[in-house]
C-alpha cells in the first residue's frame, strides 16, 4: 500500500492557507478536481470542486475556499481564506476519474489553526496587493457525491503536537453555492 504522508500547515485565525497541488498536465489537465476533508474513520468529504471539465485558470469559490486550476502548468491552487480554529483538520486534493477511484494529489495537508491574528495576510504571503474580486453571481455546485469505499481509510495517527479535528462542520457558507470569479482582461 502507498504510504500516505502528511504536510503540516500551522496558521493563525484570519490567515490564508495557500496550497499548490501538482499534477501531470498531459493526463489530468481537464479532469475535475476537488478539495476534501478527511475525518477519522469517515469517507473523505468534498468541500469544493472545479467544473467538469475543469476550466483553465477560472477561479471557483465555495464559501471561504477558492480553487484555481492552471491547465498550462499542471497545478491546482487551493486557498482557504479567513481561517478559523474549527477549520483545523486533515485535507487532500483529488482528481475525479470515474469510474476509477479519485486520484489523490500531493501530500495530505494537516491544517492547524490557532487563535490570535498575526496581522499578516497569510503565513506564506508578502503580497503588495491581495484583492479578491468576487462578483455577485452564483451557480449550483456540481461536485460528485460518490467516494469509492476503498478510499475510506483510518487517518494516520496524529502527532502529539497536532490539534484534533473538531466535531463541528467547517464553517463555510452554503456549499451548494459556487461563485465563479472571472479573469479580468
Amino acid at each position: 500500500a502507498t504510504k500516505l504522508t502528511e504536510e503540516k500547515y500551522e496558521l493563525k485565525e484570519g490567515q490564508t492557507l495557500d496550497v499548490k497541488c501538482d499534477y501531470t498536465l498531459e493526463k489530468f489537465a481537464s479532469s475535475q478536481k476537488a478539495w476534501q476533508i478527511i475525518r477519522d474513520g469517515e469517507m473523505p468529504k468534498t468541500l469544493a470542486c472545479t467544473e467538469r471539465p475543469s476550466k483553465n485558470s477560472h477561479p471557483v469559490q465555495v464559501g471561504r475556499i477558492i480553487l484555481e486550476d492552471y491547465h498550462d502548468h499542471g497545478l491546482l491552487r487551493v486557498r482557504m481564506v479567513n481561517l478559523q480554529v474549527e477549520d483545523s483538520g486533515l485535507y487532500q486534493c483529488v482528481i475525479y476519474q470515474p469510474p476509477k477511484e479519485p486520484h489523490m494529489l500531493f501530500d495530505r495537508i494537516r491544517l492547524v489553526v490557532t487563535k490570535g491574528f498575526s496581522g499578516t495576510p497569510g503565513s506564506n504571503e508578502n503580497s503588495t496587493q491581495n484583492v479578491y474580486k468576487i462578483p455577485p453571481t452564483t451557480t449550483k455546485a456540481l461536485c460528485p457525491l460518490y467516494t469509492s469505499p476503498r478510499t475510506v481509510t483510518q487517518a494516520p495517527p496524529k502527532s502529539t503536537a497536532d490539534v484534533s479535528t473538531p466535531d463541528s462542520e467547517i464553517n463555510l457558507t452554503n456549499v451548494t453555492d459556487i461563485i465563479r470569479v472571472p479573469v479580468f482582461n
Epitope: 504536510e7 501538482d22 498550462d72 502548468h73 497545478l75 506564506n124 496587493q129 491581495n130 479573469v183
Partner: antibody, heavy 116, light 107 residues
Framework: EVQLVESGGGLVQPGGSLRLSCAAS????????MSWVRQAPGKGLDWVAS????????YYVESVKGRFTISRDNAKNSLHLQMNSLRAEDTAVYYC?????????WGQGTLVTVSS | EIVMTQSPATLSVSPGERATLSCRAS??????LAWYQQKSGQAPRLLIY???IRATGIPARFSGSGSGTEFTLTISSLQSEDFAVYYC?????????FGGGTKVEIK
C-alpha cells in the same frame, strides 16, 4: 510555440530607472501568471516578482519592494517591469517567464547593467 | 525565507554514467519543488515539477524524487547535451527561492 521576447535593458547609472517589457505569444497570456527572474553575471537564478492574470495578486522579493513594479497589459499580451532607484546589485540578465510559482517557459533575457 | 542548498557544487561525470544531484530545503516544501537545466549562454528550461513529474518533452532519463526537505534529480545515463548547470526551486512559499546550482561537467 511559446515565445517571450524581452526588451528595454541597457546601461544605467545608480539611482536611475529602466522599464523592461516582454512581448508574449503562442499561449493564452490572459490565463497565465507571469514573472520576472534575474541572473547576475556568473551567478545563480533569483526570482524578482510575479503577477496574477488580473493583477489582483502581486508578489516581490524583499530586495526590490518599493523600487520595482510589475504590471501587465492583457490586451497587448505584454508584461512590464518598472525599475527605479537602481543599484549596482541589480545588474543581471532579466528573464520574462510564464508561470507564477514555477516557470514553464523563459525568454532569452535582457541585460541590465547598473554602473557609474 | 526558505533557503535551498544544492550539492555538490560541481559534479564530474563520464557520458553514459548516472548523475545524482541533491537539493535540501531549510524547511519542508512538501512536493512543491522544481528542477531546471541551464546550458551556457541559454535560458533555463523546466525539467521536473512537483518533485517528480517530468515537464512536457523532457526525456525519461531525467527523474526526480523526494518530499519535504530532501530532493534528488537523477540523470540515468548522461548524454553530451546534458552537461549543464542544474537548479532546484521551491514554490511552496513566497518568496520563491532557488538553490545555488550544480554544474555537471564532463569527466
Amino acid at each position: 510555440e511559446v515565445q517571450l521576447v524581452e526588451s528595454g535593458g541597457g546601461l544605467v547609472q545608480p539611482g536611475g530607472s529602466l522599464r523592461l517589457s516582454c512581448a508574449a505569444s503562442g499561449f493564452t497570456f490572459s490565463s497565465n501568471w507571469m514573472s520576472w527572474v534575474r541572473q547576475a553575471p556568473g551567478k545563480g537564478l533569483d526570482w524578482v516578482a510575479s503577477i496574477k492574470q488580473d493583477a489582483s495578486e502581486i508578489y516581490y522579493v524583499e530586495s526590490v519592494k518599493g523600487r520595482f513594479t510589475i504590471s501587465r497589459d492583457n490586451a497587448k499580451n505584454s508584461l512590464h517591469l518598472q525599475m527605479n532607484s537602481l543599484r549596482a546589485e541589480d545588474t543581471a540578465v532579466y528573464y520574462c517567464v510564464r508561470g507564477g510559482w514555477r516557470f514553464e517557459s523563459w525568454g532569452q533575457g535582457t541585460l541590465v547593467t547598473v554602473s557609474s | 525565507e526558505i533557503v535551498m542548498t544544492q550539492s555538490p557544487a560541481t559534479l564530474s561525470v563520464s557520458p553514459g554514467e548516472r548523475a545524482t544531484l541533491s537539493c535540501r530545503a531549510s524547511q519542508s516544501v512538501s512536493s512543491n519543488l522544481a528542477w531546471y537545466q541551464q546550458k551556457s549562454g541559454q535560458a533555463p528550461r523546466l525539467l521536473i515539477y512537483g518533485a517528480s513529474i517530468r515537464a512536457t518533452g523532457i526525456p525519461a532519463r531525467f527523474s526526480g524524487s523526494g518530499s519535504g526537505t530532501e530532493f534528488t534529480l537523477t540523470i540515468s545515463s548522461l548524454q553530451s547535451e546534458d552537461f549543464a548547470v542544474y537548479y532546484c526551486q521551491q514554490y511552496k512559499n513566497w518568496p520563491l527561492t532557488f538553490g545555488g546550482g550544480t554544474k555537471v561537467e564532463i569527466k
